[in-house]
């Protein structure tokens, strides 16, 4: 499956929206930095099959959607930007779903990519626990926004790599 160019553009648009969502000076949040343990190995295109990487991307976008769809998230961010962000994520989910099913049969996906999906879920679980521990403070959300931007950037670079390998 050749990930469409529109997917890469969508990812870039999502990153731009995330960048625009900042509300407070990030400089006041330095002490709130946290090691979320981004599962970089899951997205390593050299180690994993293409279908696994795509599946992990899909899970990451799904989890990002879930994270930013919460009541606490709605209170933290600008509603208009958040709605635009949802649309971009939804479009990417559709692109990736088509891609995953094309790569391997639907039945095999769940078994084959269980570990990578679990790693991504645990990563987002750590993010959620961090937010809860910080009582969803503005700085906690800033740190999470920066972390999601970094993981999106990382996966965007990998998707470029996957397209080149085709």
């Amino acid at each position: 499956c050749d990930l469409p160019q529109t997917h890469s553009l969508g990812n870039r648009r999502a990153l731009i929206l995330l960048a625009q969502m900042g509300r407070i000076s990030h400089f006041s949040c330095l002490k709130d930095r946290y090691d979320f343990g981004f599962p970089q190995e899951v997205f390593d295109g050299n180690q994993f099959q293409k279908a696994q990487a795509i599946s992990a991307f899909h899970e990451m976008i799904q989890q990002t959607f879930n994270l930013f769809s919460t009541k606490d998230s709605s209170a933290a961010w600008d509603e208009t930007l958040l709605d635009k962000f949802y649309i971009e994520l939804f479009q990417q989910l559709n692109d990736l779903e088509a891609c995953v099913t094309q790569e391997v049969g639907v039945e095999e996906i769940a078994l084959m990519n269980e570990d990578s999906i679990l790693a991504v879920r645990k990563y987002f679980q750590r993010i959620t626990l961090y937010l809860m521990g910080k009582k969803y403070s503005p700085c906690a959300w800033e740190v999470v926004r920066a972390e999601i931007m970094r993981s999106f950037s990382f996966s965007t670079n990998l998707q470029k790599g996957l397209r080149r390998k085709d």
């Epitope: 930095r33 740190v143 972390e147």
Partner: antibody, heavy 121, light 107 residues
């Protein structure tokens, strides 16, 4: 390859203005902050301030607040440090360095080669 | 502001020696502590970040430890290229502050 390339050495007179630059390459310029560090002759490192090139938000050390201005032009991946009126005490080596912002990653992992500023009448 | 105090300010050692430099913060900085090496006429180089993480490409003879207010940089077996000035820096909060430096000289 990540690189921060600074502008060349400057010799200025007291009261003159100056703007030095730091150009980033080999990475996403707006994904990292750029900090500025001063080192006076034979002395230690002093943090001056920092900029987030994505939105040009800045933070300064109280010692340098009002003395210098930090800016950035993300379209050309360049950060700047400027003085409106130099003093002899501004004579120093100035370094730029990249900072991961709010991400859990190494601070100041890449540095520019430094710009020597000499202020003398 | 958080004050960073390094000791000693200078030391003389021989190749192969084990060298220890300490850094004390005026308040708890958890593990937000970095160590840099600077050679004359060169830009500083990051050695250790978050108190104990070795920066990529840095030899394993360098190690960092500590948390809260007291931190240590250890060079297990000093090499000729290690003669330089070492700085600690807190990254917990602005303004970011450096220690005054420790110069490691040849005995």
């Amino acid at each position: 390859e990540v690189q921060l390339v600074q502008s060349g050495a400057e010799v200025k007179k007291p009261g003159e203005s100056l703007k030095i630059s730091c150009k980033g390459s080999g990475y996403s310029f707006t994904s990292y902050w750029i900090g500025w560090v001063r080192q006076m002759p034979g002395k230690g490192l002093e943090w001056m301030g920092i900029i987030d090139p994505s939105d040009s938000d800045t933070a300064y050390s109280p010692s340098f607040q009002g003395q210098v201005t930090i800016s950035a032009d993300k379209s050309i991946s360049t950060a700047y440090l400027q003085w409106s009126s130099l003093k002899a005490s501004d004579t120093a080596m100035y370094y730029c360095a990249r900072h991961p912002g709010l991400n859990w990653a190494p601070d100041f992992d890449y540095w520019g080669q430094g710009t020597l500023v000499t202020v003398s009448s | 502001d958080i004050q960073m105090t390094q000791s000693p300010s200078s030391l003389s050692a021989s190749v192969g020696d084990r060298v220890t430099i300490t850094c004390r913060a005026s308040q708890s900085i958890t593990n937000f502590l970095n160590w840099y090496q600077q050679k004359p006429g060169k830009a500083p180089k990051l050695l250790i970040y978050f108190a104990s993480s070795l920066q990529s490409g840095v030899p394993s003879r360098f190690s960092g430890s500590g948390s809260g207010t007291d931190f240590t940089l250890t060079i297990s077996s000093l090499q000729p290229e290690d003669f330089a000035t070492y700085y600690c820096q807190q990254s917990l909060d602005f303004p970011l502050t450096f220690g005054q430096g420790t110069k490691v000289e040849i005995k």
